[in-house]
């Protein structure tokens, strides 16, 4: 069979949620392999995912070193088999990714309601503080640790018997809301970073309702 040309990667796309960050690209390789390099604007190009036939590369370990830095990646196409390199002077083809700033761009993962507790006409709703892969002093930081007050949560709540929703906001992971005595309520939360221009909001958490296992009801 004849030789084919090495082709450059295209559609380089960052997929990132709560800082778990994967670079994806096309095409599926035929007689070629890929190596990815990542760099900050001022840093060295570091090779990762050597000679791979995958079309994705997990770059989490690199970006969590400083989530506020801006990163650039590039994907090299290397001939592997019955192919000819189309790079000039023996240089392999490569394609650059868009720039990526994790702190500003990572998607906020779907939050989870950890618990709710009713005391009389008050309900305390707690949002799980999800662990990220960002490390400090050898421990993993939570989403709140990383974003601090930049991160707020919006609570949507409504009586089980009606569809009218109310909202509350907090810059902690807890809400304290007023409810009508003797009524069951349902809750859903959403993570929000108001200062962002893109990827401002997470998807809504699964709905949790009073009278189910997750909550605790105490009549005072």
């Amino acid at each position: 069979s004849g030789t084919t040309n090495t082709v450059a990667a295209y559609n380089l796309t960052w997929k990132s949620t709560n800082f778990k960050t994967i670079l994806e690209w096309e095409p599926k390789p035929v007689n070629q392999v890929y190596t990815v390099q990542i760099s900050t604007k001022s840093g060295d190009w570091k090779s990762k995912c050597f000679y791979t036939t995958d079309t994705e590369c997990d770059l989490t370990d690199e970006i969590v070193k400083d989530v506020k830095q801006t990163y650039l990646a590039r994907v090299f196409s290397y001939p592997a088999g019955n192919v000819e390199s189309t790079g000039s002077a023996g240089e392999p083809l490569y394609e650059n990714s868009p720039e990526f700033t994790p702190y500003l761009e990572t998607n906020l993962g779907q939050p989870t309601i950890q618990s709710f507790e009713q005391v009389g006409t008050k309900v305390n709703v707690t949002v799980e503080d999800e662990r990220t892969l960002v490390r400090r002093n050898n421990t993993f930081l939570s989403l709140r640790d990383v974003f601090g007050k930049d991160l707020i949560y919006t609570l949507y709540y409504w009586k089980s018997s009606s569809s009218g929703k109310k909202t509350a906001k907090t810059n902690t992971n807890e809400f304290l809301i007023d409810v009508d005595k003797g009524e069951n309520y349902c809750f859903s939360v959403q993570a929000v970073i108001p200062s962002r221009t893109v990827n401002r909001k997470s998807t809504d958490s699964p709905v949790e309702c009073m009278g189910q296992e997750k909550g605790e009801f105490r009549e005072i």
Epitope: K46, K65, Y78, P79, G81
Partner: antibody, heavy 117, light 106 residues
Framework: EVQLVQSGAEVKKPGESLKISCKGS????????MNWVRQMPGKGLEWMGM????????RLNQKFKDKATLSVDKSISTAYLQWSSLKASDTAMYYC??????????WGQGTTVTVSS | EIVLTQSPATLSLSPGERATLSCSAS?????MNWYQQKPGQAPRIWIY???NLASGIPARFSGSGSGTDFTLTISSLEPEDFAVYYC?????????FGGGTKVEIK
């Protein structure tokens, strides 16, 4: 011109420690992974592992995990391979080699390590 | 780890003859290199990416293969070709070398 210059031959006794070096020049030392390869007398090549000088990340062949340690000193563009307690079976030629694609191929001249009582 | 088995261990041939060196992998490999090593010297890249000749390597050398079976072929041996040849896979960590094939003068 890219060059990797390794330290000279070593003769050691079992149980002694040793650190051999590989000095890079003619390129950005921190930008390239550095491989270490072992060749026991009359035998083939074995990939021991590699280190990225900019942040000292290592990828180590598990076979050598408890035997040898890779390190770097960026300030003098030097990579190191060290042992805390040598054995006779560590007797070998050790090569450093810059991780490169394709025709780019830069190896040190090798360091002979002899461990004998 | 991927084990690479080279055969034969020794190939005794005369100048002008064709040499076929095999490298068999214990599981599928997508990126294979070949190195040449002469006594007292460091190895030197010979073929990379299965079939690409390194800079300055004469066209009498060729590489081929896929999956688990790879071949280095020398169409007509020259005196300077007598050496040991190693295959190396870089598809998965740890990267591994074959045991080598010594091409010696008959």
């Amino acid at each position: 011109e890219v060059q990797l210059v390794q330290s000279g031959a070593e003769v050691k006794k079992p149980g002694e420690s040793l650190k051999i070096s590989c000095k890079g020049s003619g390129y950005s030392f921190t930008s390239y992974w550095m491989n270490w390869v072992r060749q026991m007398p009359g035998k083939g090549l074995e990939w021991m592992g590699m280190i990225y000088p900019a942040d000292s990340e290592t990828r180590l062949n598990q076979k050598f995990k408890d035997k040898a340690t890779l390190s770097v000193d960026k300030s003098i563009s030097t990579a190191y391979l060290q042992w805390s307690s040598l054995k006779a079976s560590d007797t070998a030629m050790y090569y450093c080699a810059r991780e490169d694609y394709g025709s780019s191929d830069y190896w040190g001249q090798g360091t002979t390590v002899t461990v004998s009582s | 780890e991927i084990v690479l088995t080279q055969s034969p261990a020794t190939l005794s041939l005369s100048p002008g003859e064709r040499a076929t060196l095999s490298c068999s992998a214990s599981s599928s490999v997508s990126y294979m290199n070949w190195y040449q090593q002469k006594p007292g010297q460091a190895p030197r890249i010979w073929i990379y990416g299965i079939s690409n000749l390194a800079s300055g390597i004469p066209a009498r050398f060729s590489g081929s293969g896929s999956g688990t079976d790879f071949t280095l072929t020398i169409s007509s041996l020259e005196p300077e070709d007598f050496a040991v040849y190693y295959c190396q896979q870089k598809s998965s960590f740890p990267w591994t070398f074959g045991g080598g094939t010594k091409v010696e003068i008959k």
